[in-house]
Structure formats: structure tokens, C-alpha cells
Interface confidence: low
């Protein structure tokens, strides 16, 4: 069935900033998609088009992106009468119309909004759930429920505390299924809240952009200690492991790293890549840390390579790869990491996201599907992670509705699959290997 109408509008994300929402109509109904946006954006990702009109939303309006959809993309797609199941054709058409390498003409937020809506319409057109349609587009013969990576302690640029490292996550890999993983995550989260409240006072349990706590601590090790305590108190020591998103590009300073970058600058306290790697190795030794994302700056290729070769854990590339096939290919060649963080808005279309995922998986990497810090109630990535069988998703803490929207959708998917549901569990890095 072809597209009858497309209408885009400005809506608000979870941080109160404008973002793009797209309504796409076919004879089967209305299909709506909303685009997320990141706080820390990598320099190699597709361009999120903002108006830069300082008199409106502090320059963060997206009326230009909306206009590109309504005035240019919509008429073109409607006139072409392409079937909504032809995801690749539609995405390629938009990319060709844009004509830039980083989607800077229309904006990745414009192209992605339409692309997501097309994908949703395609699933209904085929009469299958969205996750099954995505599996089909990706050439996967099965679907797998992921291990959720709950971001429960926030630091870095996202938080107002002194903590340098951006995210401390819990992964309930020992759960029997996704529902149990949610229960474990929620119980650890509430135990963590009590632990933080006892140690740092009630104010320290205020939540950040992604639903995690941001206690005013400086030492990253203290964050891990809090997690270890909460996991123990909840009674899940044998079922929960820890992941971190360091976002080291945020505190990279002239070839070195400043773990106290939120204080006045003092080059004498910067540490070398090797010293930072040693710190990570001490974390791995002392805590059940199984995954570290962006441990080094996006251009510190040597440090990545050395660490991945010796750490023995999952090393995730986000700022390093920005879901960009060219960056992924380079990282594969240089053995810089062993897992891709997949953010649909970093590359700007469903087709390219699927290609990036397949490229990573074909080279033996893991893939972790991710939200952005500026989210909406859209649940596309929940179906995406199931259809792509990546086995792991991070979409915040079990708190804040825009985060739980995704987790709740995963609960529904698991329920729908019934006894056919597979949960990645301890195989989260390579869920298809048995």
C-alpha cells in the first residue's frame, strides 16, 4: 500500500526541547513516529537540523526539518506511490534527495522521522508485528528479547555532580526472561535509592535525564561500590552484572584525560590513556564490570585497540563509531572495539541502521541498541532490538515514562511471543550463538 499523506510537526522531547514527529497515512491508518536527540553528540554523526533561531527555543527549534518533510519529502514520496514495505527504496530516495553525506540538507531528524513511520506502516501492511517486520528487513529468521542495561547512576555531561563517567548500568543477565529482568532491575533500583538516601541524603535521589540517580560523588569507584551494595541488598549478586558508559571524549584533553573535568581546569591532574586503561582494569577486577562504552576519545584509536585486545570484556563503540558504516569499518580493521552502540538517529534512517548492525554482527561484534538522553514516548527501538536479535538494549533506568515506554513495549512483545519468547540472558553479547 502506498503513502497517502505525510504530516510532520514540532513536539517536545523529555528534556523540553523541540523534536520532530511524523504522521504517515496509508489506507491501513495513521502511523506516527517521533525522533530522539542526544545531549552529547559525536562529531561524525548525521546532522540533527536545528533552526538556530535564538528567539525561539534557545535556537533549538526544528521547524526547518519539519518544513523539509512537509514541503519536499512528503510530496515526493506520495507521488512516487512506493509501497510502505519497500523500506530501502524509500530511505534511499530520501537520502538521494538530500544529497549530502551527513544529511545536512533535510536533517537526519527529518529523514529518520519519515523512515521510522514508514517502517511502522510496513509492518501493518504485511500484517505482522513491527519486530517481525524488522527481523524480515534484516534477514533474521528469529527474534530475541534483550537484556536491559539500566542506567541507574548518572555522571558525565548528563549530570550536575562531579562524577566524570557518564553512566553506571546494571544488566540482569541471570534473569530467566525479560519480565524477570525488569523485576530485578526495578528492585535493584529501589534498593539503590535507599542506599544513596542513607549515605548522601534525600536530595541525592533526585533523578537525571535518563531516570538514574546523580549523587554528588567524585570517585567513579564509589559509583561501582554503590551498585555492588544495592545489588547485594536486593539479593541478586549472582544475577546482575555492571556496565559503564564512560563517554571519555567529554573529558579528553590534548591526548590525556581529566577525570575531574567538572572542576576548574588543572592540567597537572590529567592522566594518560594507559593510566585510564589501568583504572578500568582495576574496576573489572574488583567489580562485575562486563561492558565499558567509549572508554577513550573517538580519535584515540591506539588506546582503544590496546584496551580491547587486553581487557577481556565487551568494549562498546558509540562516539567512536556513531553508527556510521565508514567508522565501523575502520574500527573493525583496527580491532578497536568489539561491540557497536546502535542509535538510529546517529545515522538517520532505518535502512542504514540495519546495515550498520549487520556489518558489526558480520564481523563478530556485539550490538547494543540505545535510546538518546532526549527521548519521546515512541517505542520503535524496543521492536528494533527484538527484530535485530542484538540481545542488549539501554534505554535508561526503570523510571521516567519515556524510558519505561520502551521497556513496557518489550514486556508486551515477550507476552505476545508466549512460549516462543527467547531471552538473551548471559548470551547477551552474542545471543544467536548457542
Amino acid at each position: 500500500m502506498s503513502i497517502l499523506k505525510i504530516h510532520a510537526r514540532e513536539i517536545f522531547d523529555s528534556r523540553g526541547n523541540p523534536t520532530v514527529e511524523v504522521d504517515l497515512f496509508t489506507s491501513k491508518g495513521l502511523f506516527r513516529a517521533a525522533v530522539p536527540s542526544g545531549a552529547s553528540t559525536g562529531i561524525y554523526e548525521a546532522l540533527e537540523l536545528r533552526d538556530n533561531d535564538k528567539t525561539r527555543y534557545m535556537g533549538k527549534g526544528v521547524s526547518k526539518a519539519v518544513e523539509h518533510i512537509n514541503k519536499t519529502i512528503a510530496p515526493a514520496l506520495v507521488s512516487k506511490k512506493l509501497n510502505v514495505t519497500e523500506q530501502e527504496k524509500i530511505d534511499k530516495l530520501m537520502i538521494e534527495m538530500d544529497g549530502t553525506e551527513n544529511k545536512s540538507k533535510f536533517g537526519a531528524n527529518a529523514i529518520l522521522g519519515v523512515s521510522l513511520a514508514v517502517c511502522k506502516a510496513g509492518a501493518v501492511e504485511k500484517g505482522v508485528p513491527l519486530y517481525r517486520h524488522i527481523a524480515d528487513l534484516a534477514g533474521n529468521s528469529e527474534v530475541i528479547l534483550p537484556v536491559p542495561a539500566f542506567n541507574v547512576i548518572n555522571g558525565g555531561s548528563h549530570a550536575g555532580n562531579k562524577l566524570a563517567m557518564q553512566e553506571f548500568m546494571i544488566l540482569p543477565v541471570g534473569a530467566a526472561n525479560f519480565r524477570e529482568a525488569m523485576r530485578i532491575g526495578a528492585e535493584v533500583y529501589h534498593n539503590l535509592k535507599n542506599v544513596i538516601k542513607e549515605k548522601y541524603g534525600k536530595d541525592a535521589t533526585n533523578v537525571g535525564d535518563e531516570g538514574g540517580f546523580a549523587p554528588n560523588i567524585l570517585e567513579n569507584k564509589e559509583g561501582l561500590e554503590l551498585l555492588k551494595t544495592a545489588i547485594g541488598k536486593a539479593g541478586y549478586t549472582d544475577k546482575v552484572v555492571i556496565g559503564m558508559d564512560v563517554a571519555a571524549s567529554e573529558f579528553f584533553r590534548s591526548g590525556k584525560y581529566d577525570l575531574d573535568f567538572k572542576s576548574p581546569d588543572d592540567p597537572s591532574r590529567y592522566i594518560s590513556p594507559d593510566q585510564l586503561a589501568d583504572l578500568y582494569k582495576s574496576f573489572i577486577k574488583d567489580y562485575p564490570v562486563v561492558s565499558i562504552e567509549d572508554p577513550f576519545d573517538a580519535d584515540d584509536w591506539g588506546a582503544w585497540q590496546k584496551f580491547t585486545a587486553s581487557a577481556g570484556i565487551q568494549v562498546v563503540g558509540d562516539d567512536l563509531t556513531v553508527t556510521n558504516p565508514k567508522r565501523i569499518a575502520k574500527a573493525v580493521n583496527e580491532k578497536s572495539c568489539n561491540c557497536l552502540l546502535l542509535k538510529v538517529n546517529q545515522i538517520g534512517s532505518v535502512t542504514e541502521s540495519l546495515q550498520a548492525c549487520k556489518l558489526a554482527q558480520a564481523n563478530g561484534w556485539g550490538v547494543m541498541v540505545s535510546h538518546r538522553s532526549g527521548e519521546t514516548e515512541d517505542t520503535f527501538i524496543a521492536d528494533l532490538v527484538v527484530g535485530l536479535c542484538t540481545g542488549q538494549i539501554k534505554t535508561g533506568a526503570p523510571c521516567r515514562s519515556e524510558r519505561l515506554a520502551k521497556y513496557n513495549q518489550l514486556l508486551r512483545i515477550e507476552e505476545e511471543l508466549g512460549s516462543k519468547a527467547k531471552f538473551a540472558g548471559r548470551n547477551f553479547r552474542n545471543p544467536l550463538a548457542k
Epitope: G127, D136, S419
Partner: antibody, heavy 119, light 107 residues
């Protein structure tokens, strides 16, 4: 290539039980749901149920509930279907069938096992 | 349970003919429909899934259409190897049920 090889023909008396095996090869056994379908002589196809070798989840056709048990042995990539309290109208060819791309589509079938129930 | 009704029950045709078999579901099954071909003494073979998608290796003379409750299997130009029994099956929830079959014979 994917192959499903079933056990040989069986002759059983009414009231007895039969256990049919289906050995899978050419794919990761735990990655696909295994269904059982039967076909009485000269008749159509009838779905009996499925088992998910990944987690041993089962779903049975109400018609066979209480009489059928589906199991797997992942170490040998083998699925089993046991039918109890056999009656003469259970005489049929029993097929195992692997689910493909979309749940509910059977893209690979065993060669079938004829079970004859006769006194 | 969803009932699947095929028509006709049997059909005689010649090589080169265009043949259509229909399948009706007792309720809306969207596109959750599969067609199988079965030859005597053999297991069924997947022919079309999702109402209209051909798996790899199935000749393009076979096509499927329909959604909701009414579905059609068409063979555009019958070949000698196409004489067999054809079954439709829904997979819109369990129990999966099959049509009673359409036997395609040589005229």
C-alpha cells in the same frame, strides 16, 4: 542444508503410547520452534502443537491436550512427540516441521512417520 | 478456532493453464496465511508465506494474494510437476489450522 529425519513406522494397539523422534541437522537446533503435524490416510493436515527447544516452552492443540507431550534433547538436536491412549483414529502420518521466517510457517518438514493403531 | 475453507476441493487442468485456488478464513487473519504443496507420499512443501511472499527456490509462476479473510493462490502456467494437493494454513495465533486441501489433477 536443513534436514529433519524422523524415526521409523510404528504399529500400536489401542490404549498404548507412541513416541516419535525427529533429529535435526544443518541449523542451530535451539534457534527454531519445532511443530508436529499429522495427516490421517487420505485426509488433510492437522496441527498438534509446538515446542521451543530454546526454553522447552510448549503449546498444544486443545484437541490433544492431556494426551500429547513434546520434548527435546538439545545435546542430540532431537525433538520428540509422545501420544498416549492411542485410538484407531490416531492412525496417521506424523510430521515434525520447523518454523521458518515467520512463526507459523513451516519451511522444513521431516519425511513423516506412519503410526498405525490397530487391535 | 479459526476455520479455513478451500475451494474447489479438486480441480482438473492442463499443462499451460492458469489455475486459481481460493481459501477463506472464518475471521480476519490479516496476512497470516501460508500455502503448501504436497505430492503423494511426500511431506508438504512451503510455497508461499505471508499471503504473498515466495520463499527462495519457488518458481515465479506461483503467486499469492489477499488479506483479511479471502486469499488466492494462482499458478500462471501449469507445469507437469505442479499436479499435487495444495493446502492453505493460517498462523494468526494458535491453534494453527489448515484448509481441507485442493487436489490439482491432470485433465
Amino acid at each position: 542444508q536443513v534436514q529433519l529425519v524422523q524415526s521409523g513406522a510404528e504399529v500400536k494397539k489401542p490404549g498404548a503410547s507412541v513416541k516419535v523422534s525427529c533429529k535435526a541437522s544443518g541449523y542451530t537446533f535451539t534457534s527454531s520452534v519445532m511443530n508436529w503435524v499429522r495427516q490421517a490416510p487420505g485426509q488433510g493436515l492437522e496441527w498438534m502443537g509446538y515446542i521451543n527447544p530454546y526454553n522447552d516452552g510448549t503449546k498444544y492443540n486443545e484437541k490433544f491436550k492431556g494426551r500429547v507431550t513434546m520434548t527435546t534433547d538439545t545435546s542430540t538436536s532431537t525433538a520428540y512427540m509422545e501420544l498416549r491412549s492411542l485410538r484407531s483414529d490416531d492412525t496417521a502420518v506424523y510430521y515434525c516441521a520447523r518454523e521458518g521466517f515467520y512463526y507459523g510457517n513451516f519451511d522444513n518438514w521431516g519425511q513423516g512417520t506412519l503410526v498405525t493403531v490397530s487391535s | 478456532d479459526i476455520q479455513m475453507t478451500q475451494s474447489p476441493s479438486s480441480l482438473s487442468a492442463s499443462v499451460g493453464d492458469r489455475v486459481t485456488i481460493t481459501c477463506r478464513a472464518s475471521e480476519n487473519i490479516y496476512s497470516y496465511l501460508t500455502w503448501y504443496q504436497q505430492k503423494p507420499g511426500k511431506a508438504p512443501k512451503l510455497l508461499i508465506y505471508n499471503a504473498k511472499t515466495l520463499p527462495e527456490g519457488v518458481p515465479s509462476r506461483f503467486s499469492g494474494s489477499g488479506s483479511g479473510t479471502d486469499f488466492t493462490l494462482t499458478i500462471s502456467s501449469l507445469q507437469p510437476e505442479d499436479f499435487a494437493t495444495y493446502y492453505c494454513q493460517h498462523h494468526y495465533g494458535t491453534p494453527y489450522t489448515f484448509g481441507q486441501g485442493t487436489k490439482l489433477e491432470i485433465k
